[in-house]
């Protein structure tokens, strides 16, 4: 899987939408987790409602909110009041028993300054770009780049 880079502004919200095959993932809960180390585990931040039929209801853990549109095949995660330390590698996951299938890898990048304070062209200069069905940013002051990151080792 490629890594999607999403940029958000400190203090604002960032919304991530991970798409998936609704039939394949029928009945499965979804989760949002943060990678803990170079090769470390992914620590669960928040997961959808325990009753799958109620997955559309928003579940919150601190400043992170998740909700799943199981018919459309889209799980949406909102990171509210972004902090610099929220930057890092995350995953959207589909849960089946104790197993977790990675739907999307996301690099969250947090910027300090309003975009008009910098040359927007300097923010992202794509070097490698690839298309895939995955996370899309839905926040007006964010940048979205779908890119292939090298291994983090």
């Amino acid at each position: 899987l490629n890594t999607t880079v999403l940029q958000g502004m400190a203090g604002q919200s960032l919304r991530v939408s991970c798409t998936y095959d609704a039939l394949k993932h029928w009945g499965r809960r979804k989760a949002w987790c943060r990678q803990l180390g170079e090769e470390g585990p992914c620590q669960r931040v928040v997961s959808t409602h325990g009753v799958w039929l109620l997955a559309f209801l928003k579940k919150r853990n601190g400043s992170t909110v998740i909700a799943d549109d199981t018919l459309a095949g889209t799980v949406t995660i909102t990171l509210k009041n972004l902090q610099a330390g929220d930057a890092g590698l995350y995953q959207c996951q589909s849960l089946r028993g104790r197993e977790a299938e990675v739907l999307q890898k996301v690099l969250v990048e947090v910027l300090e300054d309003p975009l008009d304070d910098q040359d927007a062209g300097d923010l992202w200069v794509p070097e490698e770009s690839s298309s895939f069905e995955g996370a899309q940013v839905e926040h007006s002051t964010s940048r979205n780049q779908e890119t292939s990151f090298p291994p983090t080792s």
Partner: antibody, heavy 120, light 107 residues
Framework: QVQLVQSGAEVKKPGASVKVSCKAS????????MHWVRQAPGQGLEWMGW????????NYAQKFQGRVTMTRDTSISTAYMELSRLRSDDTAVYYC?????????????WGQGTLVTVSS | EIVLTQSPATLSLSPGERATLSCRAS??????LAWYQQKPGQAPRLLIY???NRATGIPARFSGSGSGTDFTLTISSLEPEDFAVYYC?????????FGGGTKVEIK
Amino acid sequence: QVQLVQSGAEVKKPGASVKVSCKASGYTFTGSYMHWVRQAPGQGLEWMGWINPNSGGTNYAQKFQGRVTMTRDTSISTAYMELSRLRSDDTAVYYCARGPLYHPMIFDYWGQGTLVTVSS
Amino acid sequence: EIVLTQSPATLSLSPGERATLSCRASQSVSSYLAWYQQKPGQAPRLLIYDASNRATGIPARFSGSGSGTDFTLTISSLEPEDFAVYYCQQLSTYPLTFGGGTKVEIK
């Protein structure tokens, strides 16, 4: 093993610019962030900003906005920090420090430091 | 910007003793706090991140705790190589800031 090797000491006059380099080895250069941190003689640490070598994207501390420029050359795995309009209080050791992709705002490996002296 | 206040400024202890260093933030930084060690003439070294996670290769005698505004770095039994200056760093809010440091010296 991860290594960050910085360029040598510099002596500059007030108003001039300085460009410090940081050559990375032992890991994939474009797979981590690079920060710059400075330390005035006998003082504490001061963060200046970061560059994402994969994209060239930067984020600078407001204090240095307009005076600092961070760039990179991925072909030689090297990051650069240029500071312009130097003043005497810019005299410091300048460090590059890696920010791992999983937690980009921590500094897990550091260069050896470059002493920049600003004096007329 | 968030101000980090470290105390004490200097800690005089003997090898084998326990060292307790404090870092207080001017506003909450959640658990987004790191600790670094710096020896004279050397670059800092990451010890702890996210308040309590030991960095790769850091001995178990180093531990961190706290959240919000009050944080502690504990060295359970000082080794000769532990005498150095220790800095805390918050990574919650831009600009990233460091404390003024605590010097751990041999008594």
